[in-house]
């Protein structure tokens, strides 16, 4: 069956670059000050190709001595970006990714931004703020999410194959109606996973099968009318 027989079911996506942030506005800073400092580490899923802004603890910049961002990415030496208020100087060590920058001048805004998040940005990000009252830090386990490419086709009579290619994390595939299914996962070196579900329907009154792919980036469904059983000419329903 040719590819043009596939019916894609998904909401139209907005391809403008989205931006995500866990930063809080000034009102929240005073309300949640102690709570935020207690929540030192945050797991944060971020969709690939979006912009991300990571925040330091909500400490007034006037109380600051040094801000340091420590960035630990897989397979790379630890990168640090530091700002010393007294001398108004910034220093970088082992930082090669030009997409990871201060949001603006660090004396005005201590936040870190990642422009156009890539799989390579998976890792741990920590802001350490040195003040006269002690050191405060906030860490992020950044999990980059990759939307899988979804395809559906028939490879044999009354057998359909649904693939969620190169998703991160692995997608989950379900079917309507349920069939006799086998699912395989293929892991790629970049951290993405391809999930392949092959199903067979023996019941002859099944006309159309729907593959539903669930993923943290959103859900997609595809459907296809099954080919007839070879040799079957007529049936009453």
């Amino acid at each position: 069956q040719p590819n043009n027989s596939l019916m894609l079911q998904t909401s139209k996506e907005n391809h403008a670059l989205a931006s995500s942030s866990l930063c809080m506005d000034e009102k929240q800073i005073t309300q949640n000050y102690s709570k935020v400092l207690a929540e030192v580490n945050t797991s944060w899923p971020v969709k690939m190709a979006t912009n991300a802004v990571l925040c330091c603890p909500p400490i007034a910049l006037r109380n600051l001595i040094i801000i340091t961002w420590e960035i630990i990415l897989r397979g790379q030496p630890s990168c640090t970006k530091a700002y010393k208020k007294e001398t108004n100087e910034t220093k970088e060590t082992n930082c090669t990714d030009e997409r990871i920058t201060w949001v603006s001048r660090p004396d005005q805004n201590s936040d870190l931004q990642i422009r156009t998040v890539a799989i390579t940005h998976d890792g741990y990000y920590r802001c350490i703020m040195v003040t006269p009252d002690g050191n405060f830090h906030r860490g992020y386990h950044l999990q980059v999410l990759v939307t899988p490419e979804v395809t559906l086709f028939q490879n044999r009579n009354r057998t359909a194959v649904c693939k969620a290619v190169a998703g991160k994390p692995a997608a989950h595939i379900s079917w309507i109606p349920e069939g006799d299914c086998a699912t395989k996962q293929e892991y790629w070196s970049n951290g993405t996973v391809t999930v392949k579900s092959t199903c067979h329907w023996e019941v002859h009154n099944v006309s159309t099968v729907t593959c539903h792919v669930s993923h943290l980036t959103g859900n997609k469904s595809l459907y296809i009318e099954l080919l007839p059983v070879p040799g079957a000419k007529k049936s009453a329903k």
Epitope: P2, N4, S5, P177, N205, T208, K234
Partner: antibody, heavy 114, light 107 residues
Framework: QVQLVQSGAEVKKPGASVKVSCKAS????????MHWVRQAPGQGLEWMGN????????NYDEKFQGRVTMTADTSTSTVYMELSSLRSEDTAVYYC???????WGRGTLVTVSS | DIQMTQSPSSLSVSVGDRVTITCQAS??????LHWFQQKPGKAPKLLIS???NLEDGVPSRFSGSGSGTDFTFTISSLQPEDIATYYC?????????FGQGTKLEIK
């Protein structure tokens, strides 16, 4: 863009037969099921059956079993629906549809009247 | 056969109203479906395919949701041109079956 062009309106006597045609273009004719649906005046929609032109495989709804015949001519990309032993309650608009029900013809009015 | 129970069968509406139509598949059997709009003398027009996918050129005030056996079709703010009859169609099992239709009438 898939296009389904149906034959014109028909007036038939009770007991007669009618054959409605539906010519498809814009897609691979032999790769998609073609369905027939009818609608009596002021009534809802009723599925009659389907045919797979690539193999001639057919499914008929039990209600029409023995009275309906669906065929396909792959040389002209045309499907046919023939309904025999017509009665007044077969007066309806008959639609062909394909691409899992997403493309419809404009319909053919069949009037059965003595 | 799968029966599609569509409700309500008719609805008196005003321009600007939010309209909700439901379809439920019998026997607790999960299915997939389309939603159609039909105006007098015209063929049904596909609005929502596969339960929730808005067809190209269809205004965004139309939406579909649901999965399994229970589905909902919504018009967020009714316009005069939306006065029509609406049908659901399950296409998972043969025979394909339609809901009995919901006719919208102006109050």
């Amino acid at each position: 863009q898939v296009q389904l062009v149906q034959s014109g309106a028909e007036v038939k006597k009770p007991g007669a037969s009618v054959k409605v045609s539906c010519k498809a273009s814009g897609h691979t004719f032999t790769s998609y099921w073609m369905h027939w649906v009818r609608q009596a005046p002021g009534q809802g929609l009723e599925w009659m059956g389907n045919i797979y032109p690539g193999s001639g495989s057919i499914n008929y709804d039990e209600k029409f079993q023995g009275r309906v015949t669906m065929t396909a001519d792959t040389s002209t990309s045309t499907v046919y629906m023939e309904l025999s032993s017509l009665r007044s309650e077969d007066t309806a608009v008959y639609y062909c549809l394909t691409m899992t029900g997403t493309s419809w013809g404009r319909g053919t009015l069949v009037t059965v009247s003595s | 056969d799968i029966q599609m129970t569509q409700s309500p069968s008719s609805l008196s509406v005003s321009v600007g109203d939010r309209v909700t139509i439901t379809c439920q598949a019998s026997q607790g059997t999960p299915i997939n479906l389309h939603w159609f709009q039909q105006k007098p003398g015209k063929a049904p027009k596909l609005l929502i395919s596969g339960a929730s996918n808005l067809e190209d050129g269809v205004p965004s005030r139309f939406s579909g949701s649901g999965s399994g056996t229970d589905f909902t079709f919504t018009i967020s703010s009714l316009q005069p041109e939306d006065i029509a009859t609406y049908y659901c169609l399950q296409f998972t099992y043969i025979p394909w079956t339609f809901g009995q239709g919901t006719k919208l009438e102006i109050k």
